[in-house]
């Protein structure tokens, strides 16, 4: 805590200029005003305070504004906003996307902060929904933004926005989440025809049932090994090798190398060995010819 | 994002002379002052001299009026800090520093 002490004869600050920098931490708490700071808070970025500096005019702010910065002071935070506290940030009331970019970019090339996180909260909740423009704007600055979003929280995700989702942004999603996201993006892509459908459908399959995975098969769209081997394991079981083989195309080949890798393993479980012969890859483990198939789970549904 | 790397410092004699440098890439360097500061052994940063990259307006602390001269090069995004007339009070770590970046700082000793 910084004492309250006169300010010098000479040095009241009539503006915030980088002869501040030269100011001992009680000369600045004495000569800065606060009201004059919070105007000019754009010009505080340009100027290479020291953190000690920094927190004597943050001090300043909180003194000012105890329920909150208002938005004309946040939007100009600048690098000051490093020294806000998850805590600070939970009293703002955060509404223009421009805000909230100008706080990104201080941010910019780090991992996502807690206060970072609770700026997004704060803003996203304030929204109600995670419009198109906002998950433009968090997914450009943090790609894995999306997947760190629970399932409760996707389900606020309206169909339109999945447009600003790029295949990258999806990396780190587990089934849970797919499964949220793949039914809107199936929505949102409805109206496009089939390869464009599947270019734009692809990184969400993670999330597709078995009878989307078999429409697709029927439509030459040749699905690479690695966007297979992310489909859900109790989705593929039910596919036929000849469904497989469509789906996959020329990728079909790909099966020998992941043959011990969910879901081919367990998929290959569940095939006749004579189907899978007819690949002519080689694949072994599917069941002996003459074996009776029972679906157990077929069996306790009826019992 | 801007990258700061100092250079020039090392060990002189009171009296002597010493030029430090500031090599700055990545973002144009208009919109930001840029400073060279300085920190004591067991001592608070001090700032030592500023220059407004737009203005030209120069700022020296009073421990070093007359002694230190703080100038840029525009073309080589460099920013210098000519020393003069050392004495050993002025033995410290030299920071440059542009808006919120920091360099990792370069020594300086002045002994006999």
């Known amino acids: 805590e910084v004492e309250k002490t006169a300010c010098p004869s000479g040095k009241k600050a009539r503006e915030i200029d980088e002869s501040l920098i030269f100011y001992k931490k009680w000369e600045l708490e004495a000569c800065v005003d606060a009201a004059l700071l919070a105007t000019q808070m754009d010009r505080v970025n340009a100027i290479p305070f020291t953190y000690e500096q920094l927190d004597v005019l943050k001090h300043k702010l909180d003194e000012l504004y105890p329920q909150g910065y208002p938005e004309s002071v946040i939007q100009h935070l600048g690098y000051l906003f490093l020294k806000m506290s998850p805590e600070d940030i939970r009293k703002w009331n955060v509404t223009s996307l421009e805000t909230l970019k100008a706080l990104l970019e201080v941010n910019k090339g780090h991992e996502m902060s807690p206060q970072v996180a609770t700026l997004i909260d704060r803003f996203v909740k304030g929204r109600g929904q995670l419009d198109k423009d906002t998950l433009d704007t968090l997914t450009a600055f943090y790609p894995g933004y999306l997947c760190s979003l629970s399932p409760e929280e996707l389900s606020s995700v309206p169909p339109s926005s999945i447009w600003a989702v790029r295949p990258q942004d999806l990396d780190t999603c587990d089934p849970r989440q797919l499964d949220v996201l793949y039914p809107k993006a199936r929505l949102a892509f409805q109206n496009m025809n089939g390869s464009e459908y599947f270019v734009k459908i692809q990184s969400f399959l993670g999330g597709a049932p078995t009878e989307d995975l078999k429409a697709l098969s029927q439509q030459n769209v040749s699905m690479d090994l690695a966007t297979f081997m992310k489909l859900r394991t109790d989705a593929v079981l039910p596919l036929t090798v000849a469904e497989v083989q469509k789906l996959l195309g020329p990728h079909v080949e790909g099966l020998k190398a992941e043959e011990r890798h969910r879901p081919v393993r367990d998929w290959i479980l569940r095939q006749r060995q004579d189907d899978l012969d007819t690949l002519g890859l080689g694949l072994q483990g599917g069941i002996p010819n003459g074996y009776l198939v029972l679906d157990l789970s077929m069996q306790e549904a009826l019992s | 994002q801007v990258q700061l790397v100092e250079s020039g410092g090392g060990l002189v004699q009171p009296g002597g002379s010493l030029r430090l440098s500031c090599a700055a890439s990545g973002r144009t360097l208009e919109s930001y002052v840029m400073a060279w500061f300085r920190q004591a052994p067991g001592k608070g940063l001090e700032a030592v001299a500023s220059?407004?990259?737009?203005?030209?307006?120069?700022i020296y602390a009073d421990s070093v009026k007359g002694r230190f001269t703080i100038s840029r090069d525009n073309s080589k995004n460099t920013l210098y800090l000519q020393m003069n007339s050392l004495r050993a009070e002025d033995t410290a770590v030299y920071y440059c520093?542009?808006?919120?970046?920091w360099g990792q700082g370069t020594q300086v000793t002045v002994s006999s």
């Open positions: 520093a542009a808006g919120r970046y």
């Open positions: 220059i407004n990259w737009s203005s030209g307006r120069l």
